[in-house]
């Protein structure tokens, strides 16, 4: 439905888990206007270019990663930073822009042997920051109090995508984060064009699956900017095109 499309985020647009910190910008927008009221929080406007606070990469946009703006900085002041393009230095996969991964400290192009699920669940070190706590929010490598013999299935509560089974990601739904299916080719996805659009929705979509990217649907090019429909589409390389 249009409603669910308008209220769906990409997985990497989670609000910061500030554990009750007042007035953070990651407030929810009503799925049905006039029904949902995020208490005590100001809505964040689309034109707000303030740095977006974060605790982990999943809270940032698809073209961003979470880190301190200065090397060795305090974990408490981490923000979402622009991803690094090919051949730029990196310390972990999330630092590299979509379609790339971190190999030997350099962002290189992803190939068929590197699936996003593997990428997300491997190296997660940061710039020497201590991620143990952030404003009282308990940071865990797995969901504490739960003995996970199997990874989370669809609808299971999660903290990050590595808590979920293969083919699923951890995305916000209502007031929880749950395992949802990674998007397939042709499915509607959400592309955030502006930094200020973070954390606005409470219904989030996963990212597009391996080999896919979130692009404007061809027959929607004429639509207004605010209503452009994005779908998961096969990668098209600039240097050569395959015609079938």
């Amino acid at each position: 439905t249009l409603n669910s499309v308008l209220n769906s985020n990409a997985i990497k647009n989670l609000p910061p888990p500030l554990g009750g910190a007042a007035g953070h910008p990651g407030s929810a927008v009503s799925a049905a206007p006039g029904i949902l009221y995020p208490g005590g929080n100001k809505y964040q406007t689309i034109d707000n270019y303030q740095p977006y606070p974060c605790a982990e990469d999943e809270e940032c946009g698809t073209d961003e990663y979470c880190a301190s703006p200065t090397r060795g900085g305090d974990a408490g002041v981490q923000i979402c930073l622009a991803c690094r393009k090919r051949r730029k230095r990196c310390m972990r996969h999330a630092m590299c822009c979509p379609g790339n991964y971190c190999k030997n400290g350099i962002c290189v192009s992803s190939d068929q042997n590197h699936f996003r699920g593997e990428i997300e669940e491997t190296i997660t070190e940061s710039f020497g920051n201590d991620h143990s706590t952030l404003d009282g929010y308990s940071r865990r490598t797995t969901l504490s109090s739960k003995m996970y013999h199997t990874k989370g299935q669809e609808g299971s509560v999660c903290l990050r995508s590595s808590d979920c089974a293969s083919g699923l990601c951890c995305a916000r739904h209502f007031w929880s984060k749950i395992c949802k299916p990674v998007l397939k080719e042709g499915q509607v996805c959400t592309k955030h064009r502006r930094k200020g659009s973070h954390g606005l929705e409470i219904f989030q979509r996963c990212y597009c699956g391996e080999g896919l990217s979130c692009r404007i649907q061809k027959d929607h090019h004429q639509a207004s900017n605010s209503s452009r429909l994005h779908t998961c589409q096969r990668h098209h390389h600039h240097h050569h095109h395959h015609h079938h």
């Epitope: 439905t1 409603n3 669910s4 769906s8 609000p15 910061p16 888990p17 500030l18 554990g19 009750g20 910190a21 007042a22 953070h24 990651g26 407030s27 929810a28 009503s30 799925a31 049905a32 029904i35 949902l36 009221y37 995020p38 208490g39 005590g40 929080n41 009282g136 929010y137 308990s138 865990r140 969901l143 504490s144 109090s145 739960k146 669809e154 609808g155 299971s156 509560v157 903290l159 995305a171 739904h173 209502f174 007031w175 929880s176 749950i178 949802k180 299916p181 409470i202 219904f203 979509r205 996963c206």
Partner: antibody, heavy 117, light 111 residues
């Protein structure tokens, strides 16, 4: 074992106030969403309020501006401050958490609120 | 908001019989590849208990005789063989949209 225990219910006059509490144990309280759901006598269930693990709060139109949900993670406690109470707020109030999945998967035993003159 | 209609209002059956409860939503509760439909059981004087979430997944500690099915707007809770402790009121609930809403309930009583 996840346990939720509500308290604070009672008889209150229309226009009055009441504060409900829910004591949680058996899980990392601060990390999970928790909600209030009520049930009027002989009626069905109605969602009242929720608070996420990151502290955002949510209400339906029926209680917006009158009820306030809050949590004290240090005390593993959830609260519902109810002001400007009406007769139609009479119900058993349950706290429920979304612990293993997105649904209301663990519930307390409930506390009864009666609004009557 | 999404309105859920349960039928029948009352189901009179004997222990050992199969119970089939229906829940119809005013609009689809499917999204993100998940059917956001849940089922709860409530006995007199007790809190509800989650039986099924995501249309067909069993909650923790729920006996295998309880199963859920359906997608879109039509959902079914099936109790394969009624036990004496299964006589109760059953509610469906959607979590696709805010506010989360509940059906009016189906009472399963002893015939």
């Amino acid at each position: 074992e996840v346990q939720l225990v509500e308290s604070g219910g009672g008889l209150v006059q229309p226009g009055g106030s009441l504060r409900l509490s829910c004591a949680a144990s058996g899980f990392t309280f601060s990390s999970y969403a928790i909600s209030w759901v009520r049930q009027a006598p002989g009626k069905g269930l109605e969602w009242v309020a929720s608070v996420s693990g990151w502290g955002d709060t949510y209400y339906p139109d029926s209680v917006k501006g009158r009820f306030t949900i809050s949590r004290d993670n240090a005390k593993n406690s959830l609260y519902l401050q109810m002001n400007s109470l009406r007769a139609e707020d009479t119900a058993v109030y349950y706290c429920a958490t979304s612990y293993e999945n997105y649904a209301f998967d663990y519930w307390g035993q409930g506390t009864t609120v009666t609004v009557s003159s | 908001e999404i309105v859920l209609t349960q039928s029948p209002a009352t189901l009179s059956l004997s222990p050992g019989e199969r119970a089939t409860l229906s829940c119809r939503a005013s609009e689809s509760v499917d999204d993100f590849g998940i059917s956001f439909m849940n089922w709860y059981q409530q006995k007199p004087g007790q809190a509800p208990r989650l039986l099924i979430y995501a249309a067909s997944k069993q909650g923790s500690g729920i006996p295998a005789r309880f199963s859920g099915s359906g997608s879109g707007t039509d959902f079914t809770l099936t109790i394969s063989s009624l036990e004496p402790e299964d006589f109760a009121v059953y509610y469906c609930q959607q979590s696709k949209e805010v506010p989360p809403t509940f059906g009016g309930g189906t009472k399963v009583e002893i015939k």
